[in-house]
Interface confidence: medium
Amino acid sequence: GPAKSPYQLVLQHSRLRGRQHGPNVCAVQKVIGTNRKYFTNCKQWYQRKICGKSTVISYECCPGYEKVPGEKGCPAALPLSNLYETLGVVGSTTTQLYTDRTEKLRPEMEGPGSFTIFAPSNEAWASLPAEVLDSLVSNVNIELLNALRYHMVGRRVLTDELKHGMTLTSMYQNSNIQIHHYPNGIVTVNCARLLKADHHATNGVVHLIDKVISTITNNIQQIIEIEDTFETLRAAVAASGLNTMLEGNGQYTLLAPTNEAFEKIPSETLNRILGDPEALRDLLNNHILKSAMCAEAIVAGLSVETLEGTTLEVGCSGDMLTINGKAIISNKDILATNGVIHYIDELLIPDSAKTLFELAAESDVSTAIDLFRQAGLGNHLSGSERLTLLAPLNSVFKDGTPPIDAHTRNLLRNHIIKDQLASKYLYHGQTLETLGGKKLRVFVYRNSLCIENSCIAAHDKRGRYGTLFTMDRVLTPPMGTVMDVLKGDNRFSMLVAAIQSAGLTETLNREGVYTVFAPTNEAFRALPPRERSRLLGDAKELANILKYHIGDEILVSGGIGALVRLKSLQGDKLEVSLKNNVVSVNKEPVAEPDIMATNGVVHVITNVLQPPANRPQERGDELADSALEIFKQASAFSRASQRSVRLAPVYQKLLERMKH
């Protein structure tokens, strides 16, 4: 058969939950402390909550059925009677009463024909303000007749025909009634919720609703024009040219900011947006949803997309509607011919209308922002240059911030990219130019995206002119080649000598992508004599070992994930892992990761790595090979300085350093 409507699916679920109580029994959730009842869907059934309020489950006859004394459940179909009688069956006795008062209407309801009545519940009539009720029943009940006729359609309409966004023609001056049928199974009629649907009558069908509905005469734009509370919104809509859309056909939800909402915004922020056509359009579009959303349709958190493209979380807490968790809706369900308006008393400013400074102020990077401002870079954060700000998280500065000196200023300038980027378009090997004139590289890993040593820690925030990338550490631009880095740091003097003697200087000076696990002088000194001799006595072996310390791609710590097997220039793979923020290579911790170079990255280690081939065969017995002899002689001789041993000068240097 045809696919079931959401309402029918929910009803089916309620029937399923009630079947242990007998045939045609439906489980109903009632919000504690209210008379609000809902047929239950799966999610609500397990959560036992509606709009954050606890519910109790009760079991009632499903629509169209009734109990039989002495029998289980609701085995009997309700007897069919005319529409007037059926109003009583569904409990809409006040509608019956008012029907009687009109004199003309009861004969219609009892006579031939086919009609649909959206009958307000007794509570709905009772909740009408006294002056509204008085106006309905005065004027020889003409108003009452008109009001009731507006609740009627001149044919039978069942819920499976009630489609989302459709309009029905009422029996009052052919005025439209708006129908919305939501994915959660809730059906609304002019934003009144269907409580009991599809009660058949001999001459039609009755649907019980939770409000008295009235005709809709104005479009959204006209309502904005009429209401004093929308003075600022009115001006903004006019300036943006959105009035054409808001008075046209369609079905929208306008989350309409009141004057009070605009007044909550600091003057400069507001005036900047109102004076910028693009930002203004984005601001207003962020208050418009692509379809009509009645308050009654919200029974739990729901993600909705605005015309601007931002996702809002619309939810409810008891009787209050919430947006992004805040109860800012002051007046709900104002119906327009082209949608529905909810008054809100807080402005929803999208990222796309914000300056970099505003984006950053709302993120976990406020410490970095203060540094940028103190360094005199504030204009870049609030201006109209197309920029990307690489802002380290506050946690990066938990041990304090650097003093604002020339070095810090320069470092901060290198955290601002001269283009407005989006991380989804970044690619591996891409270079980005900073305000400080540096070229930064992009590294794309399986689970992270890094710029030099710093990786993106949160989704981009794209503002009016600038984009904010939240970074996991302070970015250090490369200052030279790997060889320059090693030569410039006296911890690596022995490594530098070894690289030179192994003929790898050229490799580590030229363009390339290397990850170098750099053993410190202490690492070399800690080598057992046998290892030391094997390393130093054979240039080929030395080169082999050193190549095992060099990966053939750039791997910064943020790109490691849990475990990466990195191919070395020697051929074997290095096992690089990250646990508790500590990088390890072959299970040995890295002392200092991520020293960036133009052709790679250096990770400082305090041990010399052994290729797999060297590990199993290793024997601890005494060895008297020529290299060891040379090493011993050189050690002794360099102390005594007596005779010349034929050693390459770099080895000589190495030996000298090993003694210290």
């Epitope: 004076g275 102020a361 204009n379």
Partner: antibody, heavy 120, light 113 residues
């Protein structure tokens, strides 16, 4: 370093006019919001007027609205305050002030002030 | 308009001792969107122009000694001087830059005992 030098103050009769000028140096003038703030003798500070970096947004205190006009000339790195229909209560030291950046905010740098006396 | 009220109006302090002054606004200066307080503090030394001390309610302007600190949120703010020095004398003003018209407090005059 940043320098703001006001000029144009003096003695004027009630109903008269004066034009204050402020010469700015040591920074990119066109990048900053600028303000006039005044201080009546022995009294506190009172914000008078604001002009945005591009001159688009202009705001006045109610007490001077319709009588004073703030303007700027980025080519000359100068800020102006045209004061018409002067009253005795306009007597004050007028400070030319630079904002923190092109984002309207607090008053970061102040000139030394120029004195305006309105008296018959 | 947002009204700024400072207290005390006069604050005599012994050098080396701490000092504290208060500023209250008639409406909240905390912008929920960025959790910033739109409040600044200034010092006007005798015969001089005012100078900026604190912005965002608590961020010290560069070059301002760390004995000055701003605190508070919403409508109640405090400026503290941990150890008053002779050069700190003058009138201290708080100012809101949340909404136009921007307004100042009437000032607290700090003097040496």
């Amino acid at each position: 370093q940043v320098q703001l030098v006001e000029s144009g103050g003096g003695l004027v009769k009630p109903g008269g006019s004066l034009r204050l000028s402020c010469a700015a140096s040591g920074f990119t003038f066109s990048d900053y919001y600028m303000y006039w703030i005044r201080q009546a003798p022995g009294k506190g500070l009172e914000w008078v007027a604001t002009i945005s970096d591009g001159g688009i947004y202009i705001y006045y205190a109610d007490s001077v609205k319709g009588r004073f006009t703030i303007s700027r000339d980025s080519a000359k790195n100068s800020l102006y305050l045209q004061m018409n229909s002067l009253r005795a209560e306009d007597t004050a030291v007028y400070y030319c002030v630079r904002g923190w950046d092109r984002y309207d905010s607090w008053f970061a740098c102040w000139g030394q002030g120029t004195t305006v006396t309105v008296s018959s | 308009d947002i009204v700024m009220t400072q207290s005390p109006l006069s604050l005599p302090v012994t050098p080396g001792e701490p000092a504290s002054m208060s500023c209250r606004s008639s409406q909240s200066l905390l912008y929920s969107s960025n959790q910033k307080n739109y409040l600044a503090w200034y010092l006007q030394k005798p015969g001089q122009s005012p100078q900026l001390l604190i912005y965002w309610g608590s961020t010290r302007e560069s070059g301002v000694p760390d004995r000055f600190s701003g605190s508070g949120s919403g409508t109640d703010f405090t400026l503290k001087i941990s150890r008053v020095e002779a050069e700190d004398v003058g009138v201290y003003y708080c100012q809101q830059y949340y909404r136009y018209p921007y307004t100042f407090g009437q000032g607290t005059k700090l003097e040496i005992k």
